[in-house]
């Protein structure tokens, strides 16, 4: 009997505090066999999918979501979810991205490493579909 899918983890490179205009890459990790990783922003209201999935280790796959030039509007909460046919995983914990003005000061590091994994509650919002592609006849918001 197959158990529930393991929760994904999320991390940010080079960290979770990013100077304005710098780049950041969110890294989503899950088990081998993932078809699609989804990076959700602010409680599912927007998301980005990728099927560019690579094997990070014999037991783990990953996908990377890069923002080339971070703007203030990129600040917020992010989390990962994945589709391993025929079902979706639970979400990762949230990771908060902070955007700061470039100070250039030598005393303050530009980034702080950050990652998030483990248990989390499903959101109670019903906004999963808000920016989703047309559902071709299916209503959404009712997950397993």
């Amino acid at each position: 009997q197959e158990e529930d899918l393991p929760r994904p983890s999320i991390s940010a490179e080079p960290g979770t505090v990013i100077p304005l205009g710098s780049h950041v890459t969110f890294v989503c990790r899950g088990p081998v066999g993932v078809q699609t990783f989804r990076l959700e922003r602010d409680s599912r209201s927007t998301y980005n999918d990728t099927e560019d999935v690579s094997q990070a280790s014999p037991s783990e796959s990953e996908a990377r979501f890069r923002i080339d030039s971070v703007r203030e509007g990129n600040a917020g909460l992010y989390r990962c979810i994945y589709y391993k046919p025929p079902k979706w995983s639970e979400q990762s914990d949230y990771l908060e991205l902070l955007v700061k003005e470039s100070s250039g000061g030598p005393d303050s590091p530009d980034t702080e490493p950050g990652s998030s994994a483990g248990p989390t509650q499903r959101p109670s919002d019903n906004s999963h579909n808000e920016h989703a592609p047309a559902s071709q006849g299916l209503k959404a918001e009712h997950l397993y």
Partner: antibody, heavy 121, light 107 residues
């Protein structure tokens, strides 16, 4: 609207192969999977396998791993199922069905009209 | 493999009746169950997805319920066009598996 148009009926000799097609329209072909389902006359439905055209990943029932091969052509939005080493047990109607998963759940929602395969010497 | 058991192979009903078709999974499949209607010579038509959600265009006399291992498709105010075969499907795990079907016929 979503449509899955399947190829016409096939009459084949035992031991040969057939290749069935399923042309998709009305949605983005690479955003969904495509399942194939077998139904023998007067019988129930049997899942054969599923392919994800975006990357070609496919999943099969253990029963048909040596019988069926699923492929997809993104340029023509067409999925294919090849059945080989045909026997009378393969005589059936074969349906393709869209496997929709974009909104955070799975649903086999739209079905093709079916292709009848008759294996006879 | 997960076995989906539809214990009633045939069910007799009359126009206007309410009928419930059941499906039992051999293990917990959460709400990953769909219901299909099939008429002779036609392809299956999706009625219910995720145990309780009506597909587009499906009349509201069709209702799905259940989660875990026990699922029910209820047709209230049966119409003559509802006479058909009904199949459940689990999509929690591969291989996807269907119930054997329940044929709804007139008394």
């Amino acid at each position: 609207q979503v449509q899955l148009q399947q190829s016409g009926a096939e009459l084949a000799r035992p031991g040969t192969s057939v290749k069935l097609s399923c042309k998709a329209s009305g949605y983005t072909f690479t955003s969904c999977g495509l399942s194939w389902v077998k139904q023998r006359t007067g019988q129930g439905l049997e899942w054969i396998g599923e392919i994800y055209p975006s990357n070609g990943n496919s999943y099969y029932s253990d029963k048909v791993k040596d019988k069926a091969t699923l492929t997809a052509d993104k340029s023509s939005s067409t999925a294919y199922m090849e059945l080989r080493s045909l026997t009378s047990e393969d005589s059936a109607v074969y349906f393709c069905a869209r496997a929709y998963y974009t909104n955070g759940y799975y649903a086999m929602d739209y079905w093709g009209q079916g292709t009848s395969v008759t294996v006879s010497s | 493999d997960i076995v989906m058991t539809q214990s009633q192979k045939f069910m007799s009903t009359s126009v206007g009746d309410r009928v419930s078709i059941t499906c039992k999974a051999s293990q917990n499949v959460r709400s990953a169950v769909a219901w299909y209607q099939q008429k002779p010579g036609q392809s299956p038509k999706t009625l219910i997805y995720l145990a309780s959600n009506r597909h587009t265009g499906v009349p509201d006399r069709f209702t799905g319920s259940g989660s875990g291992t026990d699922f029910t498709l209820t047709i209230s105010n049966v119409q003559s066009e509802d006479l058909a075969d009904y199949f459940c499907l689990q999509h929690w795990n591969y291989p996807l598996t269907f119930g054997a079907g329940t044929k709804l016929e007139l008394k």
